[in-house]
């Protein structure tokens, strides 16, 4: 794995008010230690699928099986937890889907669906047909175990019917659930038979039981909530970027590096150079020059634009991203062709990223 000596001092000056590079909340898959987990890459028309974990290329091994659009992890351990991505490489573009894996005592997870269809859950009965409470939509109650990233909104539903119309109340860990039991309280939408908690925190973990009752009977259903705490992580670079490119002498070219980072990233574009006729320093490490970095004079550090290129511009260009936690590094090659040759974007050459890590 490459290391290098920098020609320039890379200590950065205080920056302009930085841009936020925020990962949108990915779907969370939960497995208990020792269990197997199977995830399907939710991307369409994928010619080739590559997988990464925490930004590092994921290959098959004795516990990880990659078959088509499926990732299987056998005998999961807590070390399998992390941010995963599958990238579908197509002939004209590529797309990446991110998801989290949390290996914990909770067994299942997923996002709760929106109440787009809640009205049909409120069932009116013929007034003569007295009836004890019953569930009207058990499909919406199948997922008992919910693993949700901290700060997300959680919704538990218990669609029911009965005559007279039953009432609904909620328990937490078997005891009456009061508004003062959590900061910000909670909402109960009786019309949709739902309990809603916004901005969940670790203290919200536990068992939530809906009790639905009328004078003819009582039914209940329990959900388990696990709040998955996010922790700071190293930058993650989108697989396949920057992409290899070619252009003719005098042409222009652009390299793009897509960065995902919770913490403020410092982006550098680096190229191998020669110093005193040598490509390597006395320590045996290659000389590298910082062409651009995020900071006061950089308009968009994720893009490196080269104009009026010469043959000397050919070579490897490295996008190196660092935050206070760690680093990530990927590179692409620029081919400079003589003027008579037609240039072409080498989109198909998106091999596994070359990580410094």
């Amino acid at each position: 794995r490459p290391s290098f000596s920098l020609v320039e001092d890379t200590t950065l000056e205080p920056e302009e008010p930085p841009t936020k590079y925020q990962i949108s909340q990915p779907e969370v898959y939960v497995a208990a230690p020792g269990e197997s987990l199977e995830v399907r890459c939710l991307l369409k028309d994928a010619a080739v699928i590559s997988w990464t974990k925490d930004g590092v290329h994921l290959g098959p091994n004795n516990r990880t099986v990659l078959i088509g659009e499926y990732l299987q992890i056998k005998g999961a351990t807590p070390r399998d937890s992390g941010l995963y991505a599958c990238t579908a490489s197509r002939t004209v573009d590529s797309e990446t889907w991110y998801f989290m894996v949390n290996v914990t005592d909770a067994i299942s997870s997923g996002d709760d669906e929106d109440d787009t269809d809640g009205a049909e859950d409120f069932v009116s009965e013929n007034s003569n047909n007295k009836r004890a409470p019953y569930w009207t939509n058990t499909e919406k109650m199948e997922k008992r175990l919910h693993a949700v990233p901290a700060a997300n909104t959680v919704k538990f539903r218990c669609p029911a019917g009965g005559n007279p119309m039953p009432t609904m109340r909620w328990l937490k860990n078997g005891k009456e659930f009061k508004q003062e039991h959590r900061i910000g309280g909670y909402k109960v939408r009786n019309q949709h038979w739902s309990l809603i908690m916004e901005s969940v925190v670790p203290s919200d973990k536990g068992n939530y039981t809906c009790v639905v009752e009328n004078e003819y009977g009582s039914i209940n259903h329990t959900y388990h909530l696990d709040v998955v705490e996010r922790s700071p992580h190293r930058p993650i670079l989108q697989a396949g970027l920057p992409a290899n490119a070619s252009t003719v002498v005098g042409g222009d070219v652009e390299f793009v590096c897509k960065v995902y980072s919770d913490a403020q990233p410092h982006i550098q574009w680096i190229k191998h150079v020669e110093k005193n006729g040598s490509k390597y320093g006395p320590d045996g490490l290659p000389y590298l020059k910082v062409l651009k970095h995020s900071g006061i004079n950089s308009s968009n550090a994720e893009v490196l634009a080269l104009f009026n290129v010469t043959e000397a511009d050919a070579g490897e260009y490295i996008c190196k991203v660092s935050n206070y936690i760690g680093q990530a590094n990927q590179s692409a090659w620029l081919t400079v062709l003589p003027k008579q040759q037609a240039p072409g974007r080498e989109k198909e050459i998106t091999a596994s990223p070359d990580y410094l890590e």
Epitope: T11, E13, P14, Q264, G326
Partner: antibody, heavy 113, light 106 residues
Framework: EVQLVQSGAEVKKPGASVKVSCKAS????????MHWVRQAPGQGLEWMGA????????NYNQKFKGRVTLTRDTSISTAYMELSRLRSDDTAVYYC??????WGQGTTVTVSS | AIQLTQSPSSLSASVGDRVTITCSAS?????MSWYQQKPGKAPKLLIY???NLASGVPSRFSGSGSGTDFTLTISSLQPEDFATYYC?????????FGQGTKLEIK
Amino acid sequence: EVQLVQSGAEVKKPGASVKVSCKASGYTFTNYWMHWVRQAPGQGLEWMGAIYPENRDINYNQKFKGRVTLTRDTSISTAYMELSRLRSDDTAVYYCTSRGDYWGQGTTVTVSS
Amino acid sequence: AIQLTQSPSSLSASVGDRVTITCSASSGLSYMSWYQQKPGKAPKLLIYDTSNLASGVPSRFSGSGSGTDFTLTISSLQPEDFATYYCQQWSSYPYTFGQGTKLEIK
């Protein structure tokens, strides 16, 4: 369990150098910056610099550049901070920290003639 | 270097009180971290990336803010919360801390 274990307290004379070690365990040492922070008696926290063990990238606080040297030995998952030309106002507790949430127990360095 | 100024520098409060500590930056930042430190101990991360609660930290701690003004709030003080609190920016070199806010029992 993640642990950062630092070397023991040191007493040095002005002008001397001190080298503090920080041994990491429980996580992949090479994948995370190792930061060094110091705290003078009764004072606040001051960031000195950081080293990225995988490739030896280093960022220094300019205040200490020329006096502080950060190194690492990946074979034993240990980072080192050496401070030279010690002065009495370098008397402080020196911490190593990684990810912001892992901290060593601190190493007290006393500079006194 | 970006300077971080905390206010107040010291604060007396009682168990059960709601306490707010502010941190003002000399330049705009995207994120702020907050630490708690007790005498003779290493700092403990409370909040990272402005509002994310660190693992194992009670939910009575919360963080907010953007740009140059950031806040740490303790919704209901507990006896173990009496300590010194520091803000820190990890956005721009050199990384810097606030001067600290000492929270004492009234």
